[in-house]
């Protein structure tokens, strides 16, 4: 999916008002220096591509993020402010809602959410030069 047509300001507002708090809640009890940020993005569409991938694509050691509150809100934000997004994600979204398995927070998941926090911060500061 090409995130170019998204309403970035609305997504940013949703992140600042609610998604960021859910990410912090998920990471509670973890030191902010515990993980190094290894994933980066260069502009807002690229950041959303990376955020979407890290949030919804299962990875080795962390398969459960899609059912977290921050993920549900991310999905909803992309659906309503990125035209056509939800139609490209139909099967994944239906499966995500149907599967209500026990949530397991692994160290790998904490590391992944730490990367997500970095991507979201970068998304909110698009004019900063890439380090």
């Amino acid at each position: 999916y090409d995130f170019t047509n998204c309403d970035f300001e609305k997504i940013k507002a949703a992140y600042l008002s609610t998604i960021s708090k859910d990410l912090i809640t998920y990471m509670s009890g973890t030191k902010s220096t515990e993980f190094n940020n290894t994933v980066s993005c260069s502009n807002r569409p690229h950041c959303l591509t990376e955020i979407q991938s890290l949030t919804f694509n299962p990875t080795a050691g962390c398969a459960s993020l899609a059912k977290e509150m921050f993920a549900m809100k991310t999905k909803a934000a992309l659906a309503i402010w990125c035209p056509g997004y939800s139609e490209t994600q139909i099967n994944a979204t239906q499966a995500m809602k149907k599967r209500r398995k026990r949530k397991v927070t692994t160290n790998k998941c904490l590391e992944q959410v730490s990367q997500l926090q970095g991507l979201w911060r970068r998304f909110n500061r698009p004019l900063l030069k890439q380090q």
Partner: antibody
Framework: QVQLVQSGAEVKKPGSSVKVSCKAS????????ISWVRQAPGQGLEWMGG????????NYAQKFQGRVTITADESTSTAYMELSSLRSEDTAVYYC?????????????WGQGTLVTVSS | DIQMTQSPSSLSASVGDRVTITCRAS??????LNWYQQKPGKAPKLLIY???SLQSGVPSRFSGSGSGTDFTLTISSLQPEDFAVYYC?????????FGQGTKVEIK
């Protein structure tokens, strides 16, 4: 089966506001985007905006920005569309529409429509 | 805003005819194109989404094709219940916009 039932016809004076309701039944309400689409007499369809009730995320067409407010009450599975500063050109049938897929903005289910007449 | 232009605005056809309606977008919308049918005094009904995917419960005589800027809705064999107004709608950018409609009338 999903059903969307809208409030009855309204006659309003220019400059006033109207609030149309859309009650959903048959299935969960919160995770499905509700959009509002209007149709002036003998004219085509015009998307006004939408809401995802679960989180209150809204999106409005620029044309209606500042004049339309879309809200939802999860406890009653009802969405609302309020249009202010009414003028004669706002005379139309107002439809609420919903997708059968989570968060989707497709319009697979429609309300029966609410005729709003703006006349002095 | 993306402009959607349908042609023809109206057409007359007989039961059993093959009918084709076209929709052109003012810019590339990939395959983010939906088709709706509306009968007098009724709400629209979704027929086709994603340019070519048939909505559940819609008869197979309806089909959609195209991508980019040019799209087609085809009714392979027109039935009495198909006389209605047909609208295309783009979902590639906000605001979501509709074509002006094509009225299919009985010849």
């Amino acid at each position: 089966q999903v059903q969307l039932v809208q409030s009855g016809a309204e006659v309003k004076k220019p400059g006033s506001s109207v609030k149309v309701s859309c009650k959903a039944s048959g299935g969960t309400f919160s995770s499905y985007a509700i959009s509002w689409v209007r149709q002036a007499p003998g004219q085509g369809l015009e998307w006004m905006g939408g809401i995802i009730p679960e989180f209150g995320f809204t999106n409005y067409a620029q044309k209606f920005q500042g004049r339309v407010t879309i809200t939802a009450d999860e406890s009653t599975s009802t969405a609302y569309m309020e249009l202010s500063s009414l003028r004669s050109e706002d005379t139309a049938v107002y439809y609420c529409a919903r997708s059968g897929m989570f968060y989707s903005i497709l319009f697979d289910y429609w309300g029966q429509g609410t005729l709003v007449t703006v006349s002095s | 805003d993306i402009q959607m232009t349908q042609s023809p605005s109206s057409l007359s056809a007989s039961v059993g005819d093959r009918v084709t309606i076209t929709c052109r977008a003012s810019q590339d919308i990939y395959n983010y194109l939906n088709w709706y049918q509306q009968k007098p005094g009724k709400a629209p009904k979704l027929l086709i989404y994603g340019a070519s995917s048939l909505q559940s419960g819609v008869p197979s005589r309806f089909s959609g094709s195209g991508s980019g800027t040019d799209f087609t809705l085809t009714i392979s064999s027109l039935q009495p219940e198909d006389f209605a107004v047909y609208y295309c709608q783009q979902q590639n950018d906000y605001p979501l916009t509709f074509g002006q409609g094509t009225k299919v009338e009985i010849k």
